[in-house]
Interface confidence: low
């Protein structure tokens, strides 16, 4: 599509005569008719295939034509065409005398023609005017002409359509040859693709306008290069979205279970050694002189009844001291100055001489003890029960009543309630101070994960844009299968699809 432009510059008819030689009365009121048509080797009458245009009366006899509109007409004259410019043309310019105001061909006498010129040739599209002058015996016409493309048409023959735009379908201006030149921030064949913020992650980020970086589900940060961990993740991180990878010393689905109680809480007192023994569980090994679950209790050295043969114990800063009864001596009153002849054994104890009568030993009946069988047996005085167990006298013997989670003769063994795998359906077992707890997988509940509570994750129709929803039975979550042209965990994002079809 383009325009053939004809600029009339000067017409000379000094004698003021018609083509027939007859003079105009009072002068030749001159207007022009222009016919543009396809190339003909010999220009002949016939349809003006490329268009026609007429001027109003431009002057009398000889005159110059102004460059702008004149009497409602236009100079240059415009002959628009809506086809590919062929590069060749034929042009007929007729000068006519208008006796009256009616310029229609049928209103003019046939001899009103002043002159007629016909040219033909090749003409390339361009801004430059071609100047020409045609002379007959009585008249002379000077004019120039050119072909230019209409707005939005480009190329050697005005066949390339390019309309600058800045909307959904493109962001570009047109180069002189009709090629697109993208506006800043846009790229692609039709400049439809925004250039995202520099550094925006190629897979995890996208943009709908230039210098933007919008994150796809599961990603965050200015450049969408940081994953979002699972909601509720306490002491964990992620390397891909919705993960929860636990930090050192933490366990459980959401990394909220403490596996390193010793380090995080330092429960053991008085320089005791702490050992982790399960989730929120630990054991303290006390230094000498201390007792209690956390070694928080200081032992009196006299508590172990170190003085024998009825000696009385006195605590001292640097230990203890035994006050021995008559007939005994030594650090623990262990040496006797008596013999069996002195009947030293009480409570029916029998005396046996030792060292040729220089010493003796008492053999005590049940329930009595001491060098002279002077003490009734209390088997709990030495605090034999570990881990806070309660010691009970049972006649000649004793027993330990253990706290929950411990067993053994002296409650020295830690019991794992989880050892018998009590949690059903793949539940995770956790030892607690007073028993155990099961963390059930999705789809199960109850104290031991014995109740199936599977739900249909697709029931809430979570997928958009006609995506197909599938329930993942192993996790009771949903998966969306997106139709063509959509992405996202719920198929919520439309995308410009690549030109993958053969058209």
């Amino acid at each position: 599509s383009g325009v053939f432009q004809l600029q009339l510059q000067e017409f000379i008819n000094e004698r003021g005569v018609l083509a027939s030689g007859r003079p105009c009365e009072p002068g030749c009121r001159t207007f022009f008719r222009v016919c543009l048509k396809h190339f003909q080797a010999v220009v002949s009458p016939g349809p003006c295939t490329f268009g026609t245009v007429s001027t109003p009366v431009l002057g009398t006899n000889s005159f110059a034509v102004r460059d702008d509109s004149s009497g409602g007409g236009r100079n240059p004259l415009q002959l628009p065409f809506n086809f590919t410019w062929p590069g060749t043309f034929s042009l007929i310019i007729e000068a006519w005398h208008a006796p009256g105001d009616d310029l229609r061909p049928e209103a003019l006498p046939p001899d009103a023609l002043i002159s007629k010129i016909a040219i033909q040739g090749s003409l390339a599209v361009g801004q430059n005017w071609l100047l020409d002058e045609q002379t007959s015996t009585l008249t002379r016409l000077r004019y120039s002409y050119r072909v230019i493309c209409s707005d939005n048409y480009y190329g050697d023959n005005c066949s390339r359509l390019c309309k600058k735009r800045n909307d959904h379908f493109g962001h570009y201006v047109c180069q002189p040859d009709g090629n697109l030149s993208c506006l800043p921030g846009w790229t692609g064949e039709y400049c439809q693709q925004p250039i995202c913020l520099s550094g925006c992650h190629e897979q995890n980020g996208y943009c709908s306008k230039p210098a933007e970086c919008l994150c796809r589900p599961g990603w965050q940060g200015r450049l969408c290069n940081e994953c979002i961990p699972h909601n509720g993740c306490r002491h964990g991180t992620c390397s891909t979205p919705w993960q929860c990878t636990c930090d050192e010393g933490w366990g459980g689905l959401f990394c909220d279970q403490d596996l390193n109680y010793c380090t995080h809480h330092s429960p053991c007192k008085n320089g005791a050694t702490c050992s982790n023994s399960g989730q929120r569980s630990y054991t303290c090994t006390c230094r000498p002189g201390y007792t209690g679950v956390d070694c928080e209790l200081e032992l009196s050295e006299c508590d172990s009844n170190p003085c024998r043969n009825g000696g009385s114990c006195k605590d001292q800063e640097d230990g203890y001291h035994c006050l021995c009864p008559p007939g005994y001596y030594g650090l623990h009153c262990e040496h006797s100055t008596l013999s069996c002849a002195d009947s030293p054994c009480f409570n029916g104890g029998s005396c046996r001489e030792r060292n040729q009568g220089a010493n003796y030993a008492c053999e005590c009946p049940p329930n009595f003890t001491g060098s002279n069988c002077e003490k009734k047996v209390d088997r709990c005085t030495s605090n034999p029960c570990a881990n806070g167990g309660q010691c009970l006298n049972r006649g000649p013997s004793r027993m330990c009543r253990c706290r929950p989670g411990f067993t053994g003769t002296y409650c020295e063994l830690h019991v794992s309630d989880c050892a018998r795998n009590p949690c059903a359906h793949g539940g995770t077992c956790h030892d607690l101070e007073n028993g155990l707890m099961c963390t059930c997988p999705a789809g199960f509940s109850g104290r031991r994960c014995e109740v199936r509570t599977s739900i249909d994750a697709c029931a809430s129709s979570p997928c958009f844009n006609r995506a197909t929803c599938y329930t993942d039975l192993s996790t009771d979550t949903f998966v969306c299968n997106c139709p063509y042209g959509f992405v996202g965990s719920r198929c919520e994002f439309p995308v410009g699809l690549p030109p993958s079809f053969p058209w």
Epitope: L161, H168, F169, G170, Y190, Q192, G485, P494, G496, L497, P498, P499, S500, F501, W503
Partner: nanobody, 120 residues
Framework: EVQLVESGGGLVQPGGSLRLSCAAS????????IGWFRQAPGKEPEGISC????????YYADSVKGRFTISRDNAKSTVYLQMNSLKPEDTAVYYC?????????????TGQGTQVTVSS
């Protein structure tokens, strides 16, 4: 907002006919090519037909050539796909699409699709 809305799908017997319509809004309809593609369950999408902005250039995939005809009514901003001699393998969701330019090159916007089922 660019919108393409398909209609005319349904259940038809083998050998039967259907006429799909795609009503467009949100852009200058005369300026852009419109096409149809389909997607059967578990298969890749298949571009089956397209018509240029002027209506002068039409395209058909080999699988539908001679059976399907595409046309456009610029006054109604609508493109039609006349489907004759339908076969069971034509069963799919049919989507209307535009590349956003005058020529049939790629896809930029698509509709929600309309289901076509060919079964006896």
């Amino acid at each position: 907002e660019v919108q393409l809305v398909e209609s005319g799908g349904g259940l038809v017997q083998p050998g039967g006919s259907l006429r799909l319509s795609c009503a467009a809004s949100g852009f200058t309809f005369d300026d852009y090519a419109i096409g149809w593609f389909r997607q059967a369950p578990g298969k890749e999408p298949e571009g089956i037909s397209c018509i240029s902005s002027s209506g002068g250039i039409t395209y058909y995939a080999d699988s539908v050539k001679g059976r399907f005809t595409i046309s456009r009514d610029n006054a109604k901003s609508t493109v039609y796909l006349q489907m004759n001699s339908l076969k069971p393998e034509d069963t799919a969701v049919y989507y209307c699409a535009t590349p956003g330019i005058a020529a049939c090159r790629g896809i930029h916007y698509t509709g929600q699709g309309t289901q076509v089922t060919v079964s006896s």
